[in-house]
Protein backbone atom coordinates (compact mmCIF):
# COMPACT_ATOMS: atom_id res chain seq x y z
CA UNK A 1 0.00 0.00 0.00
CA UNK A 2 1.14 3.57 -0.64
CA UNK A 3 1.66 6.03 2.16
CA UNK A 4 1.51 9.85 1.77
CA UNK A 5 -1.71 9.93 -0.25
CA UNK A 6 0.26 9.69 -3.49
CA UNK A 7 -1.39 9.26 -6.84
CA UNK A 8 -1.03 5.80 -8.31
CA UNK A 9 0.89 6.83 -11.43
CA UNK A 10 4.60 7.10 -10.54
CA UNK A 11 6.18 10.41 -11.49
CA UNK A 12 9.89 11.08 -11.94
CA UNK A 13 11.50 12.65 -8.89
CA UNK A 14 13.89 15.56 -9.45
CA UNK A 15 16.31 14.11 -6.90
CA UNK A 16 17.62 10.87 -5.49
CA UNK A 17 15.89 9.34 -2.45
CA UNK A 18 17.85 7.50 0.24
CA UNK A 19 16.27 4.53 2.00
CA UNK A 20 17.19 2.16 4.82
CA UNK A 21 17.90 -1.31 3.50
CA UNK A 22 17.83 -4.61 5.36
CA UNK A 23 18.08 -8.06 3.73
CA UNK A 24 17.71 -6.19 0.45
CA UNK A 25 20.80 -3.99 0.06
CA UNK A 26 22.11 -3.62 -3.49
CA UNK A 27 25.82 -3.49 -4.28
CA UNK A 28 25.73 0.29 -4.58
CA UNK A 29 24.35 0.74 -1.05
CA UNK A 30 26.56 2.07 1.74
CA UNK A 31 26.07 1.58 5.50
CA UNK A 32 22.67 -0.02 4.89
CA UNK A 33 21.49 2.98 2.87
CA UNK A 34 20.42 2.58 -0.76
CA UNK A 35 19.53 5.21 -3.35
CA UNK A 36 16.61 5.27 -5.74
CA UNK A 37 14.64 7.28 -8.28
CA UNK A 38 11.48 5.63 -6.95
CA UNK A 39 10.30 4.56 -3.51
CA UNK A 40 11.50 3.32 -0.14
CA UNK A 41 9.72 0.16 1.05
CA UNK A 42 9.32 -2.09 4.04
CA UNK A 43 7.87 -5.55 3.55
CA UNK A 44 6.88 -8.35 5.88
CA UNK A 45 6.42 -11.89 4.62
CA UNK A 46 6.50 -15.43 5.93
CA UNK A 47 9.50 -17.58 5.10
CA UNK A 48 9.17 -21.27 4.27
CA UNK A 49 8.92 -22.16 7.95
CA UNK A 50 6.17 -19.62 8.59
CA UNK A 51 8.45 -17.14 10.41
CA UNK A 52 7.72 -13.47 9.66
CA UNK A 53 10.69 -11.77 7.95
CA UNK A 54 10.98 -8.00 7.58
CA UNK A 55 12.82 -6.66 4.52
CA UNK A 56 13.40 -3.02 3.58
CA UNK A 57 15.11 -1.16 0.80
CA UNK A 58 14.74 0.76 -2.45
CA UNK A 59 12.40 0.27 -5.39
CA UNK A 60 13.30 1.89 -8.70
CA UNK A 61 10.63 4.03 -10.34
CA UNK A 62 10.28 1.48 -13.13
CA UNK A 63 7.72 -1.07 -11.98
CA UNK A 64 7.50 0.28 -8.43
CA UNK A 65 3.85 1.24 -8.80
CA UNK A 66 2.95 -2.40 -9.35
CA UNK A 67 5.23 -3.61 -6.54
CA UNK A 68 3.87 -1.09 -4.03
CA UNK A 69 0.28 -2.02 -4.83
CA UNK A 70 0.47 -5.01 -2.47
CA UNK A 71 -1.77 -7.30 -4.49
CA UNK A 72 -2.54 -10.49 -2.57
CA UNK A 73 -0.63 -13.56 -3.75
CA UNK A 74 -2.36 -16.92 -3.25
CA UNK A 75 -0.79 -19.10 -0.52
CA UNK A 76 1.65 -16.34 0.44
CA UNK A 77 1.21 -14.03 3.40
CA UNK A 78 3.00 -10.76 2.81
CA UNK A 79 2.44 -7.04 3.04
CA UNK A 80 4.43 -4.12 1.63
CA UNK A 81 4.33 -0.38 2.33
CA UNK A 82 6.08 2.28 0.25
CA UNK A 83 6.92 5.92 0.88
CA UNK A 84 8.75 8.89 -0.65
CA UNK A 85 8.09 11.80 1.68
CA UNK A 86 11.63 11.99 3.11
CA UNK A 87 14.95 10.17 3.18
CA UNK A 88 14.84 6.90 5.16
CA UNK A 89 11.06 7.27 5.46
CA UNK A 90 10.76 3.47 5.46
CA UNK A 91 12.21 3.39 9.00
CA UNK A 92 8.71 4.42 10.07
CA UNK A 93 6.79 1.86 8.02
CA UNK A 94 5.43 -1.12 9.94
CA UNK A 95 3.42 -3.37 7.64
CA UNK A 96 1.60 -6.27 9.29
CA UNK A 97 0.86 -9.70 7.90
CA UNK A 98 -2.69 -10.13 6.61
CA UNK A 99 -4.84 -12.39 8.82
CA UNK A 100 -4.83 -16.10 8.10
CA UNK A 101 -7.75 -17.24 5.99
CA UNK A 102 -9.48 -20.52 6.91
CA UNK A 103 -7.96 -22.34 3.97
CA UNK A 104 -4.45 -21.33 5.09
CA UNK A 105 -4.83 -23.64 8.10
CA UNK A 106 -5.13 -26.65 5.81
CA UNK A 107 -1.49 -27.45 5.27
CA UNK A 108 -1.46 -31.23 5.52
CA UNK A 109 -2.52 -33.79 2.94
CA UNK A 110 -6.24 -33.98 2.20
CA UNK A 111 -7.79 -36.92 3.97
CA UNK A 112 -10.60 -38.77 2.20
CA UNK A 113 -13.16 -40.80 4.10
Amino acid sequence: KKEDGESTAPTARPKVLRCKCHHHCPEDSVNNICSTDGYCFTMIEEDDSGTPVVTSGCLGLEGSDFQCRDTPIPHQRRSIECCTERNECNKDLHPTLPPLKDRDFVDGPIHHK
Epitope: P14, K15, V16, E27, V30, D37, G38, C58, G60, E62
Partner: antibody
Protein backbone atom coordinates in the same frame (compact mmCIF):
# COMPACT_ATOMS: atom_id res chain seq x y z
CA UNK B 1 17.85 30.98 -14.07
CA UNK B 2 19.59 28.77 -11.51
CA UNK B 3 22.25 30.62 -9.52
CA UNK B 4 24.45 29.56 -6.62
CA UNK B 5 26.23 32.53 -5.05
CA UNK B 6 29.36 32.01 -2.98
CA UNK B 7 31.80 34.52 -1.46
CA UNK B 8 34.92 34.85 -3.61
CA UNK B 9 37.62 34.37 -0.97
CA UNK B 10 38.26 33.77 2.73
CA UNK B 11 41.52 33.93 4.69
CA UNK B 12 41.77 32.30 8.11
CA UNK B 13 44.41 31.30 10.68
CA UNK B 14 45.38 27.65 11.27
CA UNK B 15 43.23 26.02 13.97
CA UNK B 16 40.26 28.30 13.29
CA UNK B 17 36.80 27.29 12.04
CA UNK B 18 34.92 28.84 9.15
CA UNK B 19 31.36 28.67 7.81
CA UNK B 20 31.10 28.93 4.02
CA UNK B 21 27.79 29.99 2.47
CA UNK B 22 25.98 29.25 -0.78
CA UNK B 23 22.82 31.18 -1.62
CA UNK B 24 20.55 29.47 -4.14
CA UNK B 25 18.05 31.17 -6.43
CA UNK B 26 16.08 30.42 -9.59
CA UNK B 27 14.65 27.07 -8.42
CA UNK B 28 12.83 25.46 -5.49
CA UNK B 29 15.58 25.04 -2.92
CA UNK B 30 14.08 21.95 -1.26
CA UNK B 31 13.65 20.06 -4.55
CA UNK B 32 17.37 19.29 -4.95
CA UNK B 33 20.27 18.18 -2.82
CA UNK B 34 23.18 20.57 -2.28
CA UNK B 35 26.66 19.13 -2.59
CA UNK B 36 30.03 20.51 -1.59
CA UNK B 37 33.17 19.77 -3.58
CA UNK B 38 36.81 20.60 -2.86
CA UNK B 39 39.38 21.45 -5.53
CA UNK B 40 43.08 21.82 -4.85
CA UNK B 41 45.57 22.60 -7.63
CA UNK B 42 46.96 19.34 -8.95
CA UNK B 43 44.66 17.29 -6.68
CA UNK B 44 41.50 17.24 -8.78
CA UNK B 45 37.95 17.37 -7.41
CA UNK B 46 36.89 15.74 -4.15
CA UNK B 47 33.30 15.16 -3.04
CA UNK B 48 32.83 16.31 0.57
CA UNK B 49 29.17 15.49 1.07
CA UNK B 50 25.60 16.54 0.43
CA UNK B 51 22.48 17.72 2.22
CA UNK B 52 18.82 17.45 1.30
CA UNK B 53 17.25 20.78 2.30
CA UNK B 54 13.77 19.22 2.51
CA UNK B 55 14.65 17.17 5.61
CA UNK B 56 18.26 18.14 6.52
CA UNK B 57 19.42 14.62 5.68
CA UNK B 58 23.18 14.50 5.11
CA UNK B 59 25.66 12.12 3.54
CA UNK B 60 29.40 12.60 3.93
CA UNK B 61 32.56 11.31 2.36
CA UNK B 62 34.17 9.40 5.26
CA UNK B 63 37.34 11.40 4.62
CA UNK B 64 35.60 14.66 5.59
CA UNK B 65 33.61 13.43 8.60
CA UNK B 66 34.62 15.57 11.55
CA UNK B 67 36.07 18.19 9.24
CA UNK B 68 32.92 19.40 7.46
CA UNK B 69 29.39 19.93 8.77
CA UNK B 70 26.61 20.71 6.31
CA UNK B 71 23.49 22.71 7.19
CA UNK B 72 20.81 24.72 5.41
CA UNK B 73 18.51 27.64 6.11
CA UNK B 74 15.44 27.06 3.96
CA UNK B 75 13.98 30.49 4.78
CA UNK B 76 16.84 32.15 2.91
CA UNK B 77 17.57 29.26 0.49
CA UNK B 78 21.15 29.15 1.76
CA UNK B 79 23.40 26.15 2.30
CA UNK B 80 26.35 26.24 4.68
CA UNK B 81 29.47 24.22 5.23
CA UNK B 82 31.32 24.59 8.51
CA UNK B 83 34.99 23.60 8.35
CA UNK B 84 36.79 23.01 11.66
CA UNK B 85 40.41 22.86 12.90
CA UNK B 86 41.70 24.34 9.68
CA UNK B 87 45.19 23.55 8.41
CA UNK B 88 47.10 24.35 5.23
CA UNK B 89 45.69 21.10 3.77
CA UNK B 90 42.27 22.76 3.81
CA UNK B 91 43.45 25.59 1.54
CA UNK B 92 41.43 25.03 -1.63
CA UNK B 93 38.52 26.20 -3.73
CA UNK B 94 35.19 24.98 -2.31
CA UNK B 95 32.21 24.67 -4.65
CA UNK B 96 28.58 24.19 -3.78
CA UNK B 97 26.61 22.41 -6.47
CA UNK B 98 22.99 21.49 -7.12
CA UNK B 99 22.40 17.74 -7.28
CA UNK B 100 19.40 15.73 -8.41
CA UNK B 101 20.88 12.54 -9.82
CA UNK B 102 23.93 14.43 -11.11
CA UNK B 103 25.38 17.89 -10.51
CA UNK B 104 23.89 20.27 -13.05
CA UNK B 105 24.81 23.70 -11.63
CA UNK B 106 27.87 24.84 -9.69
CA UNK B 107 28.59 27.92 -7.61
CA UNK B 108 31.61 30.03 -8.62
CA UNK B 109 33.56 28.65 -5.66
CA UNK B 110 35.12 30.19 -2.55
CA UNK B 111 38.90 30.26 -2.40
CA UNK B 112 39.95 29.43 1.15
CA UNK B 113 43.47 30.30 2.28
CA UNK B 114 44.66 28.98 5.64
CA UNK B 115 47.72 30.96 6.64
CA UNK B 116 49.36 32.33 9.75
CA UNK C 1 36.02 4.27 -3.31
CA UNK C 2 35.47 4.06 -7.06
CA UNK C 3 38.58 5.21 -8.92
CA UNK C 4 37.96 7.09 -12.15
CA UNK C 5 40.91 6.88 -14.55
CA UNK C 6 40.96 9.41 -17.37
CA UNK C 7 43.21 9.27 -20.43
CA UNK C 8 45.01 11.11 -21.81
CA UNK C 9 46.04 13.68 -19.18
CA UNK C 10 46.77 16.17 -21.95
CA UNK C 11 45.27 16.27 -25.43
CA UNK C 12 46.84 18.68 -27.95
CA UNK C 13 44.50 19.23 -30.93
CA UNK C 14 44.15 21.49 -33.93
CA UNK C 15 40.94 23.48 -34.26
CA UNK C 16 38.44 21.50 -36.36
CA UNK C 17 39.94 18.15 -35.32
CA UNK C 18 38.04 15.39 -33.54
CA UNK C 19 39.00 14.79 -29.89
CA UNK C 20 38.33 11.71 -27.81
CA UNK C 21 38.70 11.32 -24.04
CA UNK C 22 38.45 8.02 -22.19
CA UNK C 23 37.22 7.40 -18.65
CA UNK C 24 37.41 4.03 -16.89
CA UNK C 25 35.93 3.21 -13.50
CA UNK C 26 37.24 0.62 -11.05
CA UNK C 27 33.69 -0.74 -10.57
CA UNK C 28 30.62 -0.94 -12.76
CA UNK C 29 28.63 2.30 -12.73
CA UNK C 30 25.31 0.58 -13.45
CA UNK C 31 23.09 1.57 -10.52
CA UNK C 32 20.58 -0.84 -8.97
CA UNK C 33 17.81 1.21 -10.64
CA UNK C 34 19.31 0.36 -14.03
CA UNK C 35 20.64 3.87 -14.65
CA UNK C 36 24.32 4.56 -15.27
CA UNK C 37 25.35 7.74 -13.45
CA UNK C 38 28.43 8.76 -15.42
CA UNK C 39 28.75 12.44 -16.35
CA UNK C 40 31.17 14.80 -18.14
CA UNK C 41 32.12 18.38 -17.20
CA UNK C 42 34.28 21.09 -18.76
CA UNK C 43 36.17 23.51 -16.53
CA UNK C 44 37.66 26.59 -18.15
CA UNK C 45 40.50 28.49 -16.41
CA UNK C 46 39.27 30.44 -13.37
CA UNK C 47 35.72 29.10 -13.70
CA UNK C 48 33.59 26.41 -12.11
CA UNK C 49 32.90 23.22 -14.07
CA UNK C 50 29.97 23.12 -16.51
CA UNK C 51 27.88 20.02 -17.15
CA UNK C 52 28.18 18.72 -20.72
CA UNK C 53 26.84 15.16 -20.66
CA UNK C 54 24.81 13.36 -17.99
CA UNK C 55 24.01 9.65 -17.62
CA UNK C 56 26.59 8.58 -20.22
CA UNK C 57 25.10 10.09 -23.38
CA UNK C 58 22.56 12.84 -22.64
CA UNK C 59 23.59 16.35 -23.68
CA UNK C 60 22.75 19.00 -21.08
CA UNK C 61 20.65 21.96 -22.26
CA UNK C 62 22.61 24.40 -24.42
CA UNK C 63 25.48 21.99 -25.09
CA UNK C 64 26.36 21.87 -28.82
CA UNK C 65 25.77 18.60 -30.66
CA UNK C 66 29.46 18.28 -31.49
CA UNK C 67 29.76 16.81 -27.96
CA UNK C 68 28.71 13.18 -27.57
CA UNK C 69 29.11 10.57 -24.84
CA UNK C 70 29.09 6.80 -25.06
CA UNK C 71 30.04 3.67 -23.13
CA UNK C 72 28.69 1.27 -20.54
CA UNK C 73 29.67 -0.55 -17.38
CA UNK C 74 33.20 0.65 -16.64
CA UNK C 75 34.32 2.11 -19.96
CA UNK C 76 33.20 5.53 -21.23
CA UNK C 77 34.17 8.02 -23.93
CA UNK C 78 33.57 11.70 -24.59
CA UNK C 79 33.95 12.80 -28.22
CA UNK C 80 34.14 16.30 -29.66
CA UNK C 81 33.56 16.06 -33.40
CA UNK C 82 35.10 19.40 -34.41
CA UNK C 83 37.06 21.22 -31.73
CA UNK C 84 36.43 24.95 -31.43
CA UNK C 85 38.47 27.50 -29.46
CA UNK C 86 35.76 27.73 -26.77
CA UNK C 87 36.13 23.99 -26.07
CA UNK C 88 39.61 24.38 -24.57
CA UNK C 89 39.92 23.62 -20.88
CA UNK C 90 39.95 20.63 -18.52
CA UNK C 91 37.42 17.83 -18.98
CA UNK C 92 36.35 15.72 -15.99
CA UNK C 93 34.31 12.55 -15.82
CA UNK C 94 32.33 11.93 -12.65
CA UNK C 95 30.25 9.12 -11.17
CA UNK C 96 27.23 9.42 -8.87
CA UNK C 97 26.38 5.71 -8.65
CA UNK C 98 28.51 4.92 -5.61
CA UNK C 99 29.00 6.99 -2.45
CA UNK C 100 31.41 8.70 -2.10
CA UNK C 101 30.97 10.23 -5.55
CA UNK C 102 34.27 10.52 -7.38
CA UNK C 103 35.87 12.38 -10.29
CA UNK C 104 38.48 11.65 -12.89
CA UNK C 105 41.77 13.54 -12.62
CA UNK C 106 40.97 15.60 -15.72
CA UNK C 107 42.09 15.86 -19.34
CA UNK C 108 43.48 19.17 -20.54
CA UNK C 109 42.41 19.96 -24.08
CA UNK C 110 44.88 22.42 -25.62
CA UNK C 111 45.91 23.78 -28.99
CA UNK C 112 48.63 21.81 -30.79
Amino acid sequence: QVQLQQPGAEVVRPGASLKLSCKASGYTFTSYWMQWIKQRPGQGLEWIGEIDPSDNYTMYNQKFKGKATLTVDTSSSTAYMQLSSLTSEDSAVYFCARFGFYVDYWGQGTTLTVSS
Amino acid sequence: DVVMTQTPLSLPVSLGDQASISCRSSQSLVHSTGNTYLHWYLQKPGQSPNLLIYKVSNRFSGVPDRFSGSGSGTDFTLKISRVEAEDLGVYFCSQSTHVPFTFGSGTKLEIK
